[in-house]
Interface confidence: low
């Protein structure tokens, strides 16, 4: 696991405990909450980050509105179950024995049930739509400059392969970033779009997960792009299963 050797920290995840106890005295970092070893050369999975967040002092969180056409993470924080690879387990339960099925980004995709609820597989979220509203500026941003800057951000900061940024749409003041990644497209070592979206969401909220890299300073041709609202929509490879009651 790559970590900064000089002071033994994890550049990509500050919610870790690191010590030089790896092979040959190498720096090894473990996620808070789960104690799982993490690869500090890439993003940590959202599941392990949520688990770490739940082990730390609780922060308030704004809930977002659900969408008609996609899943929105409007259930708030929970302490997730992660598998040995750090992915969400398909079935999640809380401390009062309420269970639900989640997708690969940990967002609920079924009605809540009890412990007899069965979740046969972890359904992949293959399309993420990040909907941003920026603060007023002197004029609209140039669309191609904005597009290039956001693609650069996802490539350099979040290590997401450019082919997974499907599109950047802009109608002032709304920016939409479309991330697409099918199971068949994701190769070993590729950052997951769900993890990239989560790091981006935390950056936008001023809660950067990166160690000592400062917050997100997003500029388009020198002009600061300040986001005042974020909504993230998640579309799964298999449609979610909610009762009609929830849809009305």
């Amino acid at each position: 696991h790559t970590a900064a050797q000089d002071n033994c920290t994890c550049p990509t995840n500050k919610m870790t405990v690191c010590s030089p106890d790896g092979p040959g005295g190498r720096c090894q970092c473990r996620a808070l909450g789960s104690g799982m070893a993490v690869d500090c050369s890439t993003l940590t999975s959202k599941c392990l980050l949520l688990k770490a967040r739940m082990s730390a002092p609780k922060n308030a969180r704004t809930l977002v509105r659900p969408s008609e056409h996609a899943l929105v993470d409007n259930d708030g924080l929970y302490d997730p179950d992660c598998d040995p690879e750090g992915r969400f387990k398909a079935r999640q339960c809380n401390q009062t024995s309420v269970c639900w099925c989640v997708n690969s980004v940990g967002v609920r995709r079924t009605d809540k049930g009890d412990l007899s609820l069965r979740c046969d597989e972890l359904v992949r979220t293959h399309h993420i739509l990040i909907d941003l509203r920026h603060r007023p500026t002197a004029g609209a941003f140039n669309h191609s400059d904005l597009d290039a800057e956001l693609r650069r951000l996802f490539r350099e900061r979040y290590r997401l392969h450019p082919k997974f940024v499907a599109a950047v749409h802009y109608e002032q003041p709304t920016i939409q970033i479309e991330l697409r990644q099918n199971t068949s497209q994701k190769a070993a070592g590729d950052v997951d779009i769900g993890d990239a979206a989560y790091y981006f969401e935390r950056d936008i909220k001023g809660e950067s997960l990166f160690q000592g890299r400062g917050g997100l300073d997003l500029r388009v041709r020198g002009e600061p792009l300040q986001v005042e609202r974020t909504l993230i929509y998640y579309l799964d490879e298999i449609p979610p299963k909610f009762s009609m009651k929830r849809l009305t």
Epitope: D79, D81, A90, C93, N94, Q95, L115, S116, L117, R118
Partner: antibody
């Protein structure tokens, strides 16, 4: 230390009811589920049901529905199993066992010592 | 209901032997399998939960593995106190179900 202490052995006639108690100590009663498992002489383990001590809601195995009642008294940290319309094949050792609930799932980390219920005419 | 089928049903071995007991679920139970040890006249004791997690205080000679439908309990070097009946249990979905047991006897 964490302990589950069950009531003593019972001898019952067919058609009667039996109520077995399980007193918990050493942990906060409402932070774990209480499961009930039975074992007929020389046989394996059979799950009967459980109670969510946090909400007070029980859940029963299909084979026992209508004959079994699981309850809990949080003031005394005691769980109860009542089985009615007893038959000779209900002769078994009845165990209470603590389980996690929620994301801890249902494995049984602490067991009572067992209560032998004998059904005989 | 999910059936848990253990094999073998009985096993004779000697102190120091490496022993493997298998458990097959009739459908996918992820890694939600526990293993218990039971001695005559006593309550079962938890050894392994979630397929591979050793319970507190359980000796390291006991290990568990598997996921999906196939699970294994291994005792790396049998000790005299290990002769007992072993049960697997799926803790994935209700009704919770156990294997029929494997009786481990001294050869």
């Amino acid at each position: 230390q964490v302990q589950l202490v069950q009531s003593g052995a019972e001898v019952k006639k067919p058609g009667a009811s039996v109520k077995v108690s399980c007193k918990a100590s050493g942990y906060t009663f409402t932070t774990a589920g209480m499961q009930w498992v039975r074992q007929a002489p020389g046989q394996g383990l059979e799950w009967m049901g459980w109670i969510n001590t946090h909400s007070g809601v029980p859940k029963y195995a299909e084979d026992f529905k209508g004959r079994v009642t699981i309850s809990a008294d949080t003031s005394t940290s005691t769980a109860y199993l009542q089985l009615s319309s007893l038959k000779s094949e209900d002769t078994a050792v009845y165990y209470c066992a603590r389980s996690g609930f929620g994301s801890h799932y249902w494995y049984f980390d602490v067991w009572g010592q067992g209560t032998l219920v004998t059904v005989s005419s | 209901d999910i059936q848990m089928t253990q094999s073998p049903s009985s096993l004779s071995a000697s102190v120091g032997d490496r022993v493997t007991i298998t458990c097959k679920a009739s459908q996918d139970v992820s890694t939600a399998v526990a293993w218990y040890q039971q001695k005559p006249g006593k309550a079962p004791k938890l050894l392994i939960y979630s397929a591979s997690h050793r319970y507190t205080g359980v000796p390291s000679r006991f290990s568990g593995s598997g996921s999906g439908t196939d699970f294994t309990l291994t005792i790396s070097s049998l000790q005299p106190e290990d002769f007992a009946v072993y049960y697997c249990q799926q803790h994935y979905i209700t009704p919770l179900t156990f294997g029929q047991g494997t009786k481990l006897e001294i050869k």
